[in-house]
């Protein structure tokens, strides 16, 4: 058993049918010595008396808010949460496996640049009685500071019969140098509590691996005289790290016909312009990627050919 | 007709070539040494140039000098004045920066040569270093030190234990590929200056 926060405790249980559970001793936080009684949640049934209460915690019916009283007055509370260990592996009931980029990905994180600021998000089908708390650091043995905000509900979507809820959090490394070479990964830890169930999720990454630039901005077309060709030009996104000559991007320019089946023409360039043939009803899209490190491509910025 | 490639442009294309060959080598190592946990998540990241060179500090873009977090690095310097700098741009900072990159490459070259020797001593040649990467290191070093002497350091005696040699190769390759990205950023920055 360990303390999650003041008066909230997590009991770790080896979870299998007929498991003996864990013996837990609760102590009433009071100078009083006698006349103390204990109850669980809203029930008025007295579970025991005395300054300490010994309970065998086996299942969720044994978890909850234990309260000690004296003569009708509440002395203190202890909330017991359960953390299930199923065959040596902590349960992951609360969050959905996003399966991207690989199985068992519960937390996904992205950064728009090398400033040390990043966003993480996760999915759940649970709509109520749910709380999250997020901590982060650079490295784990001698951790350096990363400050995270509060997790917020950022999207809701319907998937088949289920509603899916997306939560996200923004974090900022306290003293980040965009030009630094990372040798210790960022660690992100999310505590999730649903009703009386506690779970924790972690992700470990280098900022360089979660970079996803914003799409190029100011995408423009300039028709070339007496030709079906156009000059496409664009600019680096505002959110990208500066100077651009150091934090350079490379670009992919795509000409896509109206039908998804039509052959796509693609050009790769390090410049912020390209000459392409603009077909009728086609659109031109450009996306960006770090020039020297193969992290994610940005989303496409698009303009119609006409 | 032959179009002469100016110094900085040549260094830029050489560093791009080094980036490509290094990336290929990392992919090969990750695949061939998958039982040695040769992925970025699994290895300890060890910078052999730490406390020996000061590439990150001396090559820091001027625009980042106001960021205090970027300046908290260590001092050591070496001066080489190769063909990567156009004659009119010989600021001390640039010279120190390219000198530091040269020192990085020299240290990695020495380590890679030692590892290659050790790998070739082992009968089952599960992996050897890609010649393209070693040539790319050499070419960029020559451009950085074109009027200096070529220093061929004698590689240290190869590690005997094949497992440890392969683990060391993994660690070195990951650290080197990270430094090669920095070198490319620097060359891009200098050639646009």
């Amino acid at each position: 058993i360990w303390e999650l926060k003041k008066d909230v405790y997590v009991v770790e249980l080896d979870w299998y049918p007929d498991a003996p559970g864990e013996m837990v001793v609760l102590t009433c936080d009071t100078p009083e010595e006698d006349g103390i009684t204990w109850t669980l949640d809203q029930s008025s049934e007295v579970l025991g008396s005395g300054k300490t209460l010994t309970i065998q915690v086996k299942e969720f019916g044994d978890a909850g808010q234990y309260t000690c009283h004296k003569g009708g007055e509440v002395l203190s509370h202890s909330l017991l949460l359960l953390h299930k260990k199923e065959d040596g592996i902590w349960s992951t009931d609360i969050l959905k496996d996003q399966k991207e980029p690989k199985n068992k990905t519960f937390l996904r994180c992205e950064a728009k640049n090398y400033s040390g600021r990043f966003t993480c998000w996760w999915l759940t089908t649970i709509s109520t009685d749910l709380t999250f708390s997020v901590k982060s650091s650079r490295g784990s043995s001698d951790p350096q500071g990363v400050t995270c905000g509060a997790a917020t509900l950022s999207a809701e979507r319907v998937r088949g019969d289920n509603k899916e809820y997306e939560y996200s959090v923004e974090c900022q490394e306290d003293s980040a140098c965009p030009a630094a070479e990372e040798s210790l990964p960022i660690e992100v830890m999310v505590d999730a509590v649903h009703k009386l169930k506690y779970e924790n999720y972690t992700s470990s990454f280098f900022i360089r691996d979660i970079i996803k630039p914003d799409p190029p901005k100011n995408l423009q077309l300039k028709p070339l005289k007496n030709s079906r060709q156009v000059e496409v030009s664009w600019e680096y996104p505002d959110t990208w790290s500066t100077p651009h000559s150091y934090f350079s991007l490379t670009f992919c320019v795509q000409v896509q016909g109206k039908s998804k089946r039509e052959k796509k023409d693609r050009v790769f360039t390090d410049k912020t312009s390209a000459t392409v043939i603009c077909r009728k009803n086609a659109s031109i899209s450009v996306r960006a990627q770090d020039r020297y490190y193969s992290s994610s491509w940005s989303e496409w910025a698009s303009v119609p050919c006409s | 007709r032959v179009i002469p490639v100016s110094g900085p442009a040549r260094c830029l294309s050489q560093s791009r070539n080094l980036l490509k060959t290094t990336d290929d080598m990392v992919k090969t190592a990750r695949e061939k040494l998958k039982h040695y946990s040769c992925t970025a998540e699994d290895i300890d990241h060890e910078d052999i140039t730490r406390d020996q060179t000061s590439t990150l500090k001396t090559c820091l873009p001027l625009e980042l000098h106001k960021n205090e977090s970027c300046l908290a690095t260590r001092e050591t310097s070496s001066t080489t004045r190769g063909s990567c700098l156009p004659p009119q741009k010989t600021s001390l900072m640039m010279t120190l920066c390219l000198g530091s990159i040269y020192e990085d490459l020299k240290m990695y070259q020495t380590e890679f040569q030692a590892i290659n020797a050790a790998l070739q001593n082992h009968n089952h040649q599960q992996i050897i270093l890609d010649k393209g990467m070693l040539v790319a290191i050499d070419e960029l070093m020559q451009s950085l030190n074109h009027n200096g002497e070529t220093l061929r350091q004698k590689p240290p005696v190869g590690e005997a234990d094949p497992y440890r040699v392969k683990m060391k190769l993994c660690i070195l390759l990951h650290a080197f590929s990270t430094r090669v990205v920095t070198i490319n950023r620097v060359m891009g920055y200098l050639s646009s200056a």
Epitope: W15, P17, A19, E86, D87, D93, N103, K104 | -
Partner: antibody, heavy 115, light 112 residues
Framework: QVQLVESGGGVVQPGRSLRLSCAAS????????MHWVRQAPGKGLEWVAF????????YYADSVKGRFTISRDNSKNTLYLQMNSLRAEDTAVYYC????????WGQGTMVTVSS | QSVLTQPPSVSGAPGQRVTISCSGS????????VKWYQQLPGTAPKLLIY???QRPSGVPDRFSGSKSGTSASLAITGLQAEDEADYYC????????????FGTGTKVTVLG
């Protein structure tokens, strides 16, 4: 006392369907994940499928994906395996088992797929 | 096919010590715990070892398990006639959990 009893096995022709049941007793069935495991005659153990305690997530072996469906009815304390498009290689003893460090197995039910 | 490899058979005289190995990789045994089962002919598997080296109550202390790196082993000391059975190791893969990974199985024969 935890008990699992499988039923529903038998002889079936290739391409046909069969539904296996596993009746659970002696524990809070709705709190635990459940597996189906099979064993072809003279062969080793092969995992088939898993279902979470609340039925929210299901996982399948590649060899049965798209043909078999695992489900549970917590109100009836019963686990099911719906087997469609059966093949000769599905011939095996099918066991249900609880998920956890100390697991409980049923006695198994034989499924024979033969023309 | 199974990704946990066991020897097809081992044998020993009564009273002897035999060991069965179970070889995996970093993503399965290297990252997860190992169980061992005994299966007598015509019966369901019976749990012998869980969490690499723990014995459930009722399992004789002649059976012991261990794990090192990406492999595990089961040792049977003081071999007895009733130990003649098939033995299976089981673990998980970190990317496919909760799919059960079983070993290929080892037939233990008690000689004489």
């Amino acid at each position: 006392q935890v008990q699992l009893v499988e039923s529903g096995g038998g002889v079936v022709q290739p391409g046909r369907s069969l539904r296996l049941s596993c009746a659970a007793s002696g524990f809070t069935f709705s709190s635990y994940g459940m597996h189906w495991v099979r064993q072809a005659p003279g062969k080793g153990l092969e995992w088939v499928a898993f279902i979470r305690y609340d039925g929210s997530n299901k996982y399948y072996a590649d060899s049965v994906k798209g043909r078999f469906t695992i489900s549970r009815d917590n109100s009836k304390n019963t686990l099911y395996l719906q087997m469609n498009s059966l093949r000769a290689e599905d011939t095996a003893v099918y066991y249900c088992k609880t998920h956890g460090s100390h697991d409980n197995w049923g006695q198994g039910t034989m499924v024979t797929v033969s023309s | 096919q199974s990704v946990l490899t066991q020897p097809p058979s081992v044998s020993g005289a009564p009273g002897q010590r035999v060991t069965i190995s179970c070889s995996g990789s970093r993503s399965n045994i290297g990252s997860n715990t190992v169980k061992w089962y005994q299966q007598l002919p015509g019966t369901a598997p019976k749990l012998l070892i869980y969490y690499n080296d723990q014995r459930p109550s009722g399992v004789p202390d002649r059976f012991s398990g261990s794990k090192s790196g990406t492999s595990a082993s089961l040792a049977i000391t003081g071999l007895q006639a009733e130990d003649e059975a098939d033995y299976y190791c089981q673990s998980y893969d970190r990317y496919t959990h909760p799919a059960l990974l079983f070993g290929t199985g080892t037939k233990v024969t008690v000689l004489g």
